[in-house]
């Protein structure tokens, strides 16, 4: 026999079914040119001294072989001897140590045997009622198909599916959705109405995420708030990565998983912008401000679950770094300023009341003054900080004020406000005989000590009615008792008190007079 | 060693069906697998093959179009319905299974394993 005919004769060995798993398989037989075909197969298994035999069986009942030696893979024409326009079952034979090992067979009309492509280039991926949409392009003059997918997870092997037949220049695929696990498709297609025809090659890997983003586990840190008025928010445990199907393990598009950090400044309401979004690579520095950050995971079907944690404000405050100055006009605030042309947002808020919302004051970009300092200013009418009561102040500062990522805390601390010095005058003062020639004197703690770092000091001052005489008594903001000593029996003295804060000095309490008795010996 | 018995012959009028069926008791799902008959005085004579899959049938030119070969792999039966029978179908009818497939589905000689029969009468 020829090599370019099929030989009509017994094949050249004896059969002895090896039944071993190994063996040929995969054959596929198709028209590659108006009178050419080809059959290809796979071998599995040692392949030193293996002769494969292309087995073909006509529509007649005759039988012939093409000896392909090693190779795998057969070209031949119509003038073969097969006929190519009636069916026929081919197989292959391969034959190794004196056994023989067949591969499935395939019965088609050659001719018509077309060999068609898997679905190439962009294959879409939407979600449709739960399920998986997959769609592509039809690839060229090859209208009528017959689609199946194949689809693994990272725990399962392969599962093969139908598509159903394709008749349009579009081609479209249903599969299913796993919830919580990634999957890996593959397609291939074959010519519509020809069950004996051969399937294509498999598509390339579809990688699908599972129609739930993982939820995020992770933890955050702040660290200490700098010099700057900044503090660093760092991420203490990644989002644990999703496992992924073997095909998909490289940088497969279409399964990850993104996450993101989303920002919302809780601090500060009266600012441009109070949320921003960021990738979670991109750790910020923030101010000293409140925060809600989320950490929101999405993949190609849109948004999945959330996490969500509250860093709370800094609560670290700078006693000095603030002047206030009360005037017949109003109020004004003077502060150590940051750079040229730095917009400053005032926070203030009764203290107690921190779950109610702020009140703020966005300045316009400005410049510091000749002494380095920079400035706010309100008229008494406005009701700002108007009520005698402590008050929460905080100042944040940022040169790009729409940047929420960009803004620092200048200073935080207290602030008494309203008429401070009537208001903090200590009440229900008291004496008492302490001895022959001291007594003791006794108030009510001054509004202005519930205001942390207000109040500097209490003064006690004390009056000889009969010389006039004064002496003025310093005492610790923390103290509500002072001894006097060294007064005369007999001598009326008159006692007031006063809180004093940095920048103002206090109302003398109403005076309480008082004497030391004269001690009449026996 | 493959053992073959066939079932399901007997008397029919003409115009009738009968489905004969042979049980294999080896694998056979490696085999091609055909039907023969002989009528009494005469040679016997090839009816119709299939292939290992199910997917290539041939058929002898008297019988095609009226008689259908089938094969069950899980079950190792290979079936053979036959309707509108003739007079002359009458005929012992022998399963048979061809291990080797060689230059032809329809050589006696090919076939490698053999049942004992069954008989088909059709009367008139």
């Known amino acids: 026999c020829r090599t370019s005919e099929c030989c009509f004769q017994d094949p050249p060995y004896s059969d002895a079914d090896s039944g071993s798993a190994s063996g040929p398989r995969d054959l596929s037989c198709y028209r590659i040119s108006s009178a050419g075909y080809e059959c290809s197969w796979q071998y599995e298994g040692p392949t030193a001294g293996v002769s494969h035999f292309l087995r073909c069986c006509l529509s007649s009942g005759r039988c012939c072989y093409f000896a392909t030696g090693s190779a795998t893979r057969l070209q031949f024409s119509d003038q073969a001897g097969v006929s190519v326009l009636h069916t026929v079952t081919l197989w292959v034979e391969s034959w190794a140590r004196n056994r023989t090992e067949k591969s499935p067979e395939v019965t088609l009309q050659l001719y018509k045997s077309v060999k068609y492509k898997p679905p190439l280039g962009d294959i879409k991926v939407s979600k449709l009622a739960g399920q998986l949409r997959m769609e592509w392009e039809t690839p060229d003059n090859q209208v009528g198909a017959e689609v199946q997918f194949r689809h693994r997870t990272p725990s399962s092997s392969w599962k093969l599916g139908d598509c159903g037949p394709q008749d349009d220049d579009t081609e479209s695929c249903l599969c299913p959705l796993e919830m919580n696990v990634a999957q890996e498709f593959q397609l291939r297609r074959r010519r519509l109405g020809s069950q004996g025809s051969s399937w294509s090659k498999w598509s390339s890997p579809v990688c699908v995420p599972p129609e739930n983003p993982p939820q995020p586990q992770v933890r955050f840190s702040v660290e200490q708030l700098g010099r700057d008025g900044r503090r660093r928010l760092t991420l203490k445990e990644q989002p644990t990565q999703l496992e992924l199907p073997e095909g998909c393990q490289g940088p497969a598009p279409g399964v990850e998983v993104t996450y993101q950090l989303q920002l919302h400044m809780l601090s500060c309401p009266c600012k441009a912008k109070a949320t921003r979004t960021l990738p979670l690579e991109k750790m910020p520095y923030l101010s000293g401000a409140a925060y809600n950050v989320a950490v929101i995971s999405s993949n190609r079907f849109g948004p999945g679950p959330n996490q969500t944690w509250h860093i709370p404000a800094d609560t670290h405050t700078e006693p000095v770094a603030l002047n206030i100055s009360v005037g017949t006009n109003g109020t004004t605030m003077y502060w150590p300023a940051r750079a040229q042309s730095t917009t400053y947002c005032i926070e203030w808020q009764p203290v107690g009341q921190e779950g109610s919302l702020a009140t703020c004051n966005l300045t316009a970009p400005q410049d510091p003054d000749p002494a380095g300092m920079a400035t706010y200013s309100w008229s008494r009418e406005s009701g700002a900080m108007g009520q005698e009561k402590c008050y929460h102040i905080t100042i944040f500062a940022s040169a790009h004020p729409k940047k929420l990522t960009l803004w620092s805390t200048v200073l935080s601390t207290y602030h008494f406000g309203g008429n401070a010095s009537a208001a903090g005058t200590p009440h229900h003062v008291s004496v008492k005989n302490h001895s022959l020639d001291s007594v003791s004197v006794d108030w009510a703690p001054s509004l202005l000590s519930t205001c942390p770092g207000v109040l500097k000091e209490y003064v006690v001052r004390c009056r000889d009615e009969d010389s006039n005489q004064v002496s003025e008594h310093p005492v610790q903001p923390t103290e509500t008792q002072v001894t006097l000593s060294d007064l005369r029996a007999g001598v009326a003295y008159t006692v007031q008190v006063r809180a004093d804060t940095a920048w103002l000095r206090g109302a003398w309490s109403q005076p309480q007079r008082f004497s030391i008795k004269v001690q009449v010996s026996d | 060693q493959v053992q073959l018995v066939e079932s399901g012959g007997g008397l029919v009028q003409a115009g009738g069906s009968l489905r004969l069926s042979c049980l294999a008791s080896g694998r056979t799902s490696n085999y091609f697998m055909g039907w023969f008959r002989q009528a009494p005085g005469k040679e016997r004579e090839f009816v119709a093959a299939i292939s290992r899959s199910g997917g290539g049938t041939w058929y002898a030119d008297s019988v095609k179009g009226r008689f259908a070969i089938s094969r069950d792999n899980a079950k190792n039966t290979v079936n053979l319905q036959m309707n509108s029978l003739k007079r002359e179908d009458t005929a012992v009818y022998y399963c048979?299974?061809?291990?080797?497939?060689?230059?032809?589905?329809?050589?006696?000689?090919?076939?490698?394993?053999w049942g004992q029969g069954t008989q088909v009468t059709v009367s008139s």
């Open positions: 048979a299974a061809d291990r080797r497939t060689g230059t032809s589905v329809y050589t006696v000689d090919e076939y490698d394993y």
